[in-house]
């Protein structure tokens, strides 16, 4: 056991141009965090998969305010160390991801939003209980400085942490199973840890960082079934052998799900919906932490600080569950609007528009008004998916094709009298009234309550309201 | 700390049944597995049987498969031994065991895996 400690030194503008822009503004400020990832190996994993090391959080930032008209500089950081604990031997080579979120404290509905900034990954092989290793990594224009360090909690010593030796609980012997720890007789052996990863149910170990599975199960931490018959030869010391399920009609038939899980069928066997504080196949993992880096496809993993208390996944989009690990089937919401295919792209959404609609969601209408022409002068307006002609005084209907009366909706005021004309309408005024529309009453005194003159007008002009 | 207490031992005859208890009178073991072992006299300790506690894995030792049946009762936080058909060579102390938090170190019937023991009770089995 021991923890894997990281110290961000700087993260901001790279060298050389293009410099990026500040994450923050005077309307939005934010500050940021880091999240660390960690695994075994030096193989290429893809980012979604599990932390089987483990994984952190850091503390927030101070609050950041970009200055107006100054070139982005390094951002203010989050005080501490990022500290993973791991309670299996150090691996030595270990793959690493480590991504700088923004939090936006803007008034956003709902609280703060996460945006995450840049990502940076990297292979390296570092042996426990060594100095602090520098590096320096780039994500497009930005640039990050870090150092990292594995050391081991006492008891254990050697560079994998491997030497786990702790105090006889009596003088005369060691407990079951725990030998004097060789050259330190006076301290006993602790137990051996496998793989990370490697399933408490199905799998074990008898070397350090091996994985062997029970029978009828399969893969490197033990975690797919081979078959439901798998009931044959024996296994394991002693001439033991392992136990199998006899499978019912259905995979789901006496709830393979431990702790609470729910059991949905698929079409090869089943998959478990654990509660949060489990999770495994059958949910049969517990005592779950943020530091085991429970949240799966770039989750982030909020409180939890120790195994009695709850952990919350938020999951990115296109992922839910309560580790993150299940992927939305996000078109099932029909996002696509005016009939637009979508396409789930896992990292995006896609909206592929029909004629005559653009947009990410097909919201935009294009062009209603191609090949429709408005009669008589009129002038098509888009909307809808549909045309709609807005008609030249004494025209109507749809195409503007039939002439209207222009005096059918009554409009002039006061009384007036309406008469129709070649260029549109006249209203003669009822006494005390004036106006195109007779809507402006006379003054006793003669003034009358004429609206200001429109600009290019003076006072006195004739006008026309037409 | 952790206490299990085994019952259920005793006197039988052979092809007669016993049933062994373990209780955890101080801790409630929700996931891990749990075995039963046994030690005859003059001989190593061997496993008999072991649980996944939380989950639907139960194994067996060559010498007892078909004979015994290992259980748990949640409810009572109590672990079971259901020994049928039982043989003269069947007698020796048998012991509980439990894991505190599941790991995945060595074989569920190696007793290496477990850190917490019961103090045993005494099955003999003779006409």
């Known amino acids: 056991a021991g923890v894997f400690e990281l110290q961000i030194h700087s993260f901001g503008p790279g060298p050389g141009p293009g410099a990026p822009r500040s994450p923050c503004s005077a309307r939005l400020p934010c500050r940021l965090f880091f999240r660390v990832c960690l695994k075994p190996g030096l193989s290429e994993e893809a980012a979604e998969s599990p932390c089987a090391l483990g994984a952190a959080l850091s503390a927030r930032g101070p609050v950041y305010t970009e200055q107006p008209g100054a070139p982005a500089p390094d951002l203010p950081l989050p005080d501490g160390l990022l500290q993973v604990p791991f309670r299996d031997a150090w691996p030595g080579t270990f793959s690493f991801i480590i991504e700088t979120w923004r939090e936006e404290l803007g008034d956003q509905i709902g609280g703060p939003a996460w945006s995450l900034l840049a990502r940076v990954a990297g292979r390296r092989r570092l042996a426990a209980g060594g100095p602090w290793a520098r590096d320096i990594q780039r994500a497009g224009a930005w640039e990050l400085r870090f150092s990292y360090r594995a050391r081991c909690e006492p008891p254990a010593v050697g560079t994998a942490c491997t030497r786990l030796c702790r105090p006889r609980s009596a003088p005369s012997r060691c407990g079951p199973g725990l030998r004097p720890c060789a050259p330190l007789e006076d301290e006993c052996e602790a137990p051996l840890v496998c793989r990370a990863g490697c399933s408490p149910e199905h799998g074990f170990c008898e070397q350090p960082g091996e994985c062997r599975c029970l029978e009828g199960w399969t893969g490197p931490l033990c975690t797919v079934p081979v078959s439901t018959s798998s009931c044959l030869s024996p296994r394991g010391p002693s001439s033991a052998t392992t136990g199998c399920l006899v499978p019912g009609p259905g995979p789901c038939d006496g709830n393979p799900c431990a702790n609470g899980g729910s059991c949905s069928e698929t079409p090869r066997s089943f998959e478990c919906t654990c509660p949060r504080g489990f999770y495994g196949l059958r949910c049969e993992v517990s005592g779950v932490t943020c530091a085991d880096g429970p949240c799966f496809n770039g989750g982030l993993c909020v409180g939890g600080a120790d195994p009695d208390s709850a952990y919350i996944c938020h999951c990115p989009p296109g992922f839910q569950g309560s580790n993150c690990e299940k992927r939305v089937d996000r078109c099932s919401l029909q996002p696509c609007r005016n009939g637009g295919l979508c396409l789930d792209l896992g990292h995006a959404l896609r909206c592929r528009c029909r004629a005559g609609f653009a947009g990410p969601r097909c919201e935009h209408d294009l062009d209603d008004c191609a090949g429709r022409a408005c009669a008589n002068g009129g002038t098509c307006v888009e909307g809808g998916g549909a045309h709609r002609c807005s008609c030249a005084l004494g025209f109507g209907g749809r195409d503007c094709r039939e002439r209207a009366d222009p005096c059918a909706a009554r409009p002039c005021a006061h009384g007036g009298r309406c008469y129709a004309h070649f260029s549109g309408l006249v209203c003669a005024c009822a006494p005390g009234y004036m106006g195109a529309r007779c809507e402006f009453p006379v003054h006793p005194d003669g003034a009358s309550a004429l609206p200001a003159a429109p600009p290019g007008l003076r006072p006195g002009d004739p006008q026309r309201y037409l | 700390e952790v206490q299990l207490v085994e019952s259920g031992g005793g006197l039988v005859q052979p092809g007669g049944s016993l049933r062994l208890s373990c209780k955890s009178p101080?801790?409630?073991?929700?996931?891990?597995?749990m075995g039963w072992f046994r030690q005859a006299p003059g001989k190593e300790r061997e496993g008999v049987a072991a649980?996944?506690?939380?989950?639907?894995?139960?194994l067996y030792a060559d010498s007892v498969k078909g004979r015994f049946t290992i259980s748990r009762d949640n409810s009572k936080n109590t672990l079971y031994l259901q020994m049928n058909s039982l043989r003269a060579e069947d007698t020796a102390v048998y012991y509980c065991?439990?894991?505190?938090?599941?790991?995945?170190?060595?074989?569920?019937?190696?007793?290496?895996?477990?850190?917490?023991w019961g103090q045993g009770t005494l099955v003999t089995v003779s006409s």
């Open positions: 065991a439990a894991q505190l938090r599941p790991n995945s170190a060595y074989h569920p019937l190696d007793g290496r895996k477990y850190n917490y």
């Open positions: 649980i996944y506690i939380g989950g639907s894995t139960t």
């Open positions: 101080t801790y409630t073991i929700s996931s891990g597995y």
